[in-house]
């Protein structure tokens, strides 16, 4: 029998009673930044390269004793989860292992800075083929670790990352805070997250999926024999390298923006108990847990889409929040949330020549947030058509007017306080799909696109008594571009993308009156691209 | 994920200019930056990551790194140069005393500074 | 599914000597501590010992200590133990277990996480008698 | 060594009955505490670890409670299948103690 972990990423077809997915991710290298390993163990013998790279701090305490095997644990079990050939994800992967820890698992930020340094310009004097980087480490934030991040993941490098093992919000650790690196959470064998003794592991927006981090079967340096369980979020970045290196041998061509998408795309869907976390995180962490795609080739045709949210803007009444799509992302859609629902809406605009999303707080609001849904669509040319305030009391519209552009997603902001307590619903007429409509004292914003192939629908579900949430998904071959509430319900608190499911939150229905205002309705975009589905049987 | 974001403290020291044979304001009135680790315990004080502005070569790199040394030993201090970057960040590491922070945040090409902390496996 | 599978048990004089073994079954054999546990006729559960996963580590309970040997073999994917010097007081079943647990880290110290005995053998029965 | 006294010894219910078995340390164990259940002639099993966690499998009408010294199982609508005696163990240290056990009966 498999151990559970491996079963848990593998996919119905693959389950045979050996875990034998093709093609071991044997066209990529990884780099393990971490302690020092057991490069003979028999799990990862011959397919682990130990460099003379090493950069640690002492041990501390003056009682210390260097014992081997404990020097090099958490190293030689990860450098197992992710390519050892009896417990390993990727077995076919080569490693090459940098010692950036010492014996008690400690070690500098700027340790790790010269670490990642030193892949860069490997890279640079021995291009290979692609490179993923395993960093199962955190330390506080750090401005300069997430700037290196950065840098490496530009030049073409896959970051992976622990979110880390503090029980708490991901963003205040690096590298688990930097945008550019995948960061993982860690789930046990009931998908429940981890709990490590009075702590666990983080979570938040931060976070981009989590993996199999509990109770994980891997090589032991105390033999060369020797199998251990070890946890924690290093466990859980260590399958999503292996799940990494596996695509990425499939499709060598995969940028980080394609791989994260399909990471997140592939992932088990609302399988972790969200009670586990602090309750102002549970809209912010992804409910997706890693699992390899359920064939080796590309999944090319589809359209990939992934909702990310902006840091919290804070209470003042000017505060604003933004969110960032990833370079060779397109901003779709932009919507905004507040748990007091206080808010100004939020509008999509350009900052240095790229499309963000921002999100505007209201006077007495607890603050915003503002969520960008970010897609993969290339050779797209999007815009933004805005449409000021209206005088006519039809309310505010704007559509896609220009020829072969669609409309992937509404926003309107509002500069009064108080938007619709006193003013009849609007209702967006039947049979024009193409356009936003919105309050008539907000400015509404259309996100028109214009790509090979790409067609989008409206799908709307209203309720008429007020409830907390409405949701609307798009249906199976559609992915989710916009998300957004019709005008005229005060009480929303806003409206986010989970996966292919649009969410419009409500304020507490004891706290509404069942008035002509409790209806809700929540208006998906549904997306498709006819282009990428003939490319890929083309290739096919 | 947010880069400008996180719970990490951020020291701005609006520096005036001070007559200094070799010190320069950093150009277009820019303030460079101090960031330190939020968590006390994590900090490493006494070696810190000069981060020079994006475009900097690493002979430019080199040359400030030398003119902290030299400022700083004109002021009595002992300064070690660990490391200098290249091929990621341009910058360098330096094992200084904590009341250079003022100097060396004046230096030229400087975008920021951090100071160093400790990271652990997961 | 892991199994457990003891044997070597039997009966024995006041003095004499046995070795029981148990036999698991797959790599998380030796992935964990393994610890047996024993059970007088009518009584309740006694923890005997523990073994580290590389056997470079060994606990006993007072009563055996000097007289019973905990040890394992990777390679054989096997747990004994070596049982000398026998008393009356040493008549029960007893069972080879699986201590689940597992190592994590925080902030610097590798902690030990434990479970509990999830996976047991059947058992075998011991009698010391003269 | 740490000593486990489990209460009470015999315990008689019905089918439908709220139960609770308590479990005392001789000294502080966190919650360093697995509860086991076990029937004539089997070997026992894991139910409960860390004092409140729900091993795998186990139906979620067995709950665990307690820190430190005084410890609580719960079952909270007894089955014709949960009629065993029930042991607890502390492990606070790598010497491990068990409670000596509470048979629960039909009343």
């Known amino acids: 029998s498999i151990p559970w972990n491996l079963e848990r990423i593998t996919p119905p077809r693959y389950r045979a009673d050996e875990y034998q997915p093709p093609d071991g991710g044997s066209l990529v290298e990884v780099y393990l930044l971490d302690t020092s390993i057991q490069s003979d163990h028999r799990e990862i013998e011959g397919r682990v390269m130990v460099t003379d790279f090493e950069n640690v701090p002492e041990e501390d305490g003056t009682r210390f004793h260097r014992q081997a095997s404990k020097c090099d644990s958490h190293g030689t079990h990860l450098a197992g989860v992710v390519s050892g050939r009896d417990a390993g994800v990727a077995k076919g992967a080569s490693m090459r292992s940098l010692r950036v820890l010492n014996c008690q698992g400690k070690g500098t930020v700027s340790g790790t800075l010269i670490g990642l340094e030193f892949i860069r310009k490997s890279q640079l004097v021995q291009p290979v083929g692609p490179l993923v980087v395993l960093l199962p480490l955190a330390g506080g934030y750090s401005r300069v670790l997430n700037a290196a991040c950065q840098r490496l993941a530009r030049a073409g490098v896959v970051l992976v990352t622990a979110a880390g093992n503090f029980r708490d919000d991901a963003c205040l650790y690096s590298p688990a805070s930097a945008p550019e690196v995948i960061t993982v959470g860690a789930t046990n064998a009931q998908d429940q997250p981890v709990t490590l003794g009075t702590l666990g592991t983080n979570f938040g927006r931060c976070v981009d999926l989590f993996a199999p981090g509990e109770d994980i079967i891997g090589a032991s340096s105390d033999c060369s024999t020797c199998f251990v369980s070890q946890s924690g979020t290093s466990q859980a970045a260590a399958h999503v390298a292996g799940i990494a290196a596996m695509m990425l041998s499939a499709e060598p061509e995969l940028t980080l923006a394609e791989l994260r998408q399909r990471l997140i795309h592939f992932s088990a869907k609302d399988v972790i108990n969200e009670a586990w976390f602090p309750e102002d995180q549970r809209v912010l962490t992804p409910n997706l847990v890693a699992a390899l795609p359920p064939s080796t080739h590309g999944a090319g045709w589809q359209l990939f889409c992934r909702t990310v949210w902006s840091a919290h803007s804070g209470p003042t009444r000017m505060a604003t929040a933004v969110a960032r799509c990833a370079p060779d992302e397109e901003l779709l859609s932009c919507s905004s949330f507040s748990r007091s629902g206080k808010r100004r809406g939020e509008r999509m605009e350009a900052q240095g020549g790229k499309l963000v999303c921002r999100a505007h707080n209201a006077f007495g609001g607890e603050g915003v947030y503002a969520i960008a849904r970010c897609c993969l669509l290339p050779q797209a040319n999007c815009s933004v058509h805005t449409a000021p305030p209206a005088e006519a009391s039809m309310g505010t519209r704007v559509h896609c007017h220009q020829q072969g552009h669609v409309l992937t997603g509404c926003s309107s902001h509002w500069e009064v306080e108080d938007l619709g307590t006193h003013k009849p619903p609007v209702l967006r007429p039947r049979g024009q799909p193409n356009q936003c409509v919105g309050h008539r004292e907000a400015s509404i914003h259309a996100s028109c696109c214009h790509a090979p192939g790409l067609e989008c629908k409206v799908k709307e579900h209203g309720i008429p008594a007020p409830q907390e949430q409405v949701t609307v998904a798009c249906e199976e071959g559609w992915t989710l571009t916009g998300c957004s509430a019709l005008p005229g319900t005060s009480h929303v608190l806003g409206a986010y993308a989970v996966d292919n499911t649009c969410v419009v939150r409500s304020r507490d229905v004891s706290t509404t009156g069942s008035t002509s205002e409790g209806a809700v309705t929540a208006v998906a975009i549904c997306c498709r691209s006819r282009h990428l589905a003939q490319a890929s049987q083309e290739l096919q | 994920q947010e880069d400008e974001d996180g719970d990490y403290e951020e020291l701005v020291l609006a520096l005036r200019s001070e007559e200094d044979g070799l010190a320069e304001a950093p150009e277009h009135g820019t303030t460079a930056t101090f960031h330190r680790c939020a968590k006390d315990p994590w900090r490493l004080p006494g070696t810190y990551v000069v981060v020079l502005k994006e475009e900097t070569h690493l002979s430019q790199s080199e040359r400030t790194a030398r003119r902290l040394q030299a400022q700083a030993a004109r002021r009595g201090y002992l300064t070690k140069i660990l490391h200098v970057f290249h091929g990621l960040l341009p910058g360098f590491l330096v094992k200084m005393s904590g009341d250079l922070l003022e100097l060396a945040l004046k230096l030229p090409h400087v975008d920021y500074i951090e100071e160093d902390s400790s990271v652990f496996a997961q | 599914e892991v199994q457990l599978v003891e044997s070597g048990g039997g009966l024995v004089q006041p003095g004499g000597s046995l070795r029981l073994s148990c036999a698991a079954s797959?790599?998380?054999?030796?992935?964990?501590?393994m610890s047996w546990v024993r059970q007088a006729p009518g009584k309740g559960l006694e923890w005997v010992a523990n073994?580290?996963?590389?056997?470079?580590?060994?606990y006993y309970v007072d009563s055996v200590k000097g007289r019973f040997t905990i040890s394992r073999d990777i390679a054989k994917n096997s747990l004994y133990l070596q049982m000398n010097s026998l008393r009356a007081e040493d008549t029960a079943v007893y069972y080879c277990?699986?201590?689940?647990?597992?190592?994590?880290?925080?902030?610097?110290?590798?902690?030990?996480?434990?479970?509990?005995?999830?996976?047991w053998g059947q058992g075998t029965t011991v009698t010391v008698s003269s | 060594d740490i000593q486990m006294t489990q209460s009470p010894s015999t315990l008689s219910a019905s089918v439908g009955d709220r139960v609770t078995i308590t479990c005392r340390a001789s000294?502080?164990?966190?919650?360093?505490l697995a509860w086991y259940q076990q029937k004539p002639g089997k070997a026992p099993k894991l139910l409960i670890y860390?004092?409140?966690s729900l091993e795998s499998g186990v139906p979620s009408r067995f709950s665990g409670s307690g820190s430190g010294t005084e410890f609580t199982l719960t079952i909270s609508s007894l089955q014709p299948d949960d009629f065993a005696t029930y042991y607890c163990?502390?492990?606070?240290?790598?010497?491990?103690?068990f409670g000596q056990g509470t048979k629960l009966e039909i009343k």
């Open positions: 277990a699986r201590d689940r647990g597992t190592y994590y880290y925080a902030s610097g110290s590798y902690n030990y996480y434990y479970y509990g005995m999830d996976v």
């Open positions: 797959g790599i998380t054999f030796s992935s964990y501590w």
């Open positions: 073994i580290k996963q590389d056997g470079s580590e060994k």
């Open positions: 000294q502080s164990i966190s919650s360093w």
């Open positions: 860390k004092a409140s």
């Open positions: 163990q502390q492990y606070n240290s790598y010497s491990y103690t």
